[in-house]
Interface confidence: low
Amino acid sequence: LPKAPVITTPLETVDALVEEVATFMCAVESYPQPEISWTRNKILIKLFDTRYSIRENGQLLTILSVEDSDDGIYCCTANNGVGGAVESCGALQVKMKPKITRPPINVKIIEGLKAVLPCTTMGNPKPSVSWIKGDSPLRENSRIAVLESGSLRIHNVQKEDAGQYRCVAKNSLGTAYSKVVKLEVEVFARILRAPESHNVTFGSFVTLHCTATGIPVPTITWIENGNAVSSGSIQESVKDRVIDSRLQLFITKPGLYTCIATNKHGEKFSTAKAAATISIAEWSKPQKDNKGYCAQYRGEVCNAVLAKDALVFLNTSYADPEEAQELLVHTAWNELKVVSPVCRPAAEALLCNHIFQECSPGVVPTPIPICREYCLAVKELFCAKEWLVMEEKTHRGLYRSEMHLLSVPECSKLPSMHWDPTACARLPHLDYNKENLKTFPPMTSSKPSVDIPNLPSSSSSSFSVSPTYSMT
């Protein structure tokens, strides 16, 4: 009698490893013999497909060499024209050892940002992914999480997160390890110890100290009043990612010193700054307080101005008086480069004789100050415009201290040659006869605060300013 097909052995789930054989059995009872077809994921398997073997009148389907892509739902359908077609389905579970398809890579990240180390896996059963840092399993916390994809996400990266990482993919068939990768945490430059401001006496040695850290270790540069430091010695040391820089300065003028710590992150830089001011304590000490000794001038700057083999006063309040006083003259002299040709020779004479004062040897060597009259001649005649500009800058606070006045005496505090001709020194370069002096035009619109007396004539002039030149 004709009998509709009945599947007596329903398909079961088949587990198979890659490259193994997998067989589905679909036992059918019917009369007449049924036609059996097979589908995978609802797509018909063709009889001539060489990857499959269909035997026992279609009741056995064999996959000859299982591939990862063979997983899916396999169904057999039996039909003999009697009654309806019958179907049974089962799954092929392609079992696969874990495989890391997208391994982690080395990462450089700035502290505080988010880092993601990839670790994409394949395998069946689905591998569980864990991570190892150094030699220990990595513990997840509020910042550190293993994502569903297997990737490691670290929020708000910290310095201590730096190290060697590898991911581990594990299932019942085995374990796969990624290569070891490095997470490098870079840290913006930061100043740990800022240089301190100082108020010192002229000619002092001061050490400014600046300490910075960062990853990579920053470099430190020093800036003086907006420009790269031109003088002074810099000593640096690096220990445990901390750079220590010491700038030793010989103080001849006030300034703003800035320590700049810089490090590089890829194409970008991070910078930290700290500044300190160096100011000079008030200079106008009474001359009698000075302590020092007489010595022949051996410098270079004032050679043309001071008399040959002149005996000058060297002030022992400096560690090295000769060097300190020469440096002071040199600093002031550089500023004279921009003054007028009328002012410059007079100002050079004044500052050389003021800094390297004539010395009176004796039991107590004494400096002989410049006579007031000569000082006023420079201030009110030769350098009137320049003096005004300088005083205006001082009043407006453009100079941080009286430094620029140090190289120029306060005329009113100097002794007059009319009180005691031996108590003060003359500037031979400014000696004129009365006739010449009368021809000087007023060089400022303001009336001189002090009447300028006649300067006595002197035959010891090494140069003179021609009256004709002075009048133009």
Partner: antibody, heavy 126, light 107 residues
Framework: EVQLVESGGGLVQPGGSLRLSCAAS????????IHWVRQAPGKGLEWVAS????????SYADSVKGRFTISADTSKNTAYLQMNSLRAEDTAVYYC???????????????????WGQGTLVTVSS | DIQMTQSPSSLSASVGDRVTITCRAS??????VAWYQQKPGKAPKLLIY???SLYSGVPSRFSGSRSGTDFTLTISSLQPEDFATYYC?????????FGQGTKVEIK
């Protein structure tokens, strides 16, 4: 990090309506299927409905067919359950859950619900 | 609809015990069975899918097996955190169904 967050629960009278939302994040919503499962106080789990975000196909438990509608807005990564003609026996904590996704067809086909929201309470009472 | 009959409805066990929970499907569901753990006031957690595949991150003391339409969840050595209610679930048809649950209590 995969997250599902339900909202929209509350107290409603019999015959009333309520719309539950399930906001998803941390996975590809458009290639997943979302399920609603409920649990009456002190009882077991009961599957309610499901939607495949990619195809839009839906399924419903017999107990809610014709009264509840499941939908999804892939642009907002959100699934919804519109509940009409509510009855006292609909009182439950409603969970949304994601069907396990795998690169293996069989594992997805046979997969369970691997991520669940925290649940939202729906009380139907006069 | 496919019915999932779970047994026992509750059991008492001690830490270290081997615990077995079974589920029987009313018709063939192939291997489309999953197991869940649920603790009071919390959402269920997936333990096993595809009848015997251990879900990622689940301790290896949990295992699943199938024999025809009978499905078993085994906890090889019960731990204090394992006291909870366990559910089986089939997804062979588009209409999913759960077992009624098994409550595992401390003896």
């Amino acid at each position: 990090e995969v997250q599902l967050v339900e909202s929209g629960g509350g107290l409603v009278q019999p015959g009333g309506s309520l719309r539950l939302s399930c906001a998803a994040s941390g996975f590809t919503f458009s290639s997943s299927s979302i399920h609603w499962v409920r649990q009456a106080p002190g009882k077991g789990l009961e599957w309610v409905a499901s939607i495949s975000s990619s195809s839009g196909s839906t399924s419903y438990a017999d107990s809610v067919k014709g009264r509840f509608t499941i939908s999804a807005d892939t642009s907002k990564n959100t699934a919804y359950l519109q509940m009409n003609s509510l009855r006292a026996e609909d009182t439950a904590v409603y969970y949304c859950a994601r069907k396990y996704w795998s690169q293996y067809y069989w594992a997805h086909y046979y997969g369970g619900l691997d991520y669940w929201g925290q649940g939202t309470l729906v009380t139907v009472s006069s | 609809d496919i019915q999932m009959t779970q047994s026992p409805s509750s059991l008492s066990a001690s830490v270290g015990d081997r615990v077995t929970i079974t589920c029987r499907a009313s018709q063939s569901v192939s291997s489309a069975v999953a197991w869940y753990q649920q603790k009071p006031g919390k959402a269920p957690k997936l333990l096993i899918y595809s009848a015997s595949s251990l879900y990622s991150g689940v301790p290896s003391r949990f295992s699943g097996s199938r024999s025809g339409t009978d499905f078993t969840l085994t906890i090889s050595s019960l731990q204090p955190e394992d006291f909870a209610t366990y559910y089986c679930q089939q997804s062979s048809s588009s209409l999913i169904t759960f077992g009624q649950g098994t409550k595992v209590e401390i003896k």
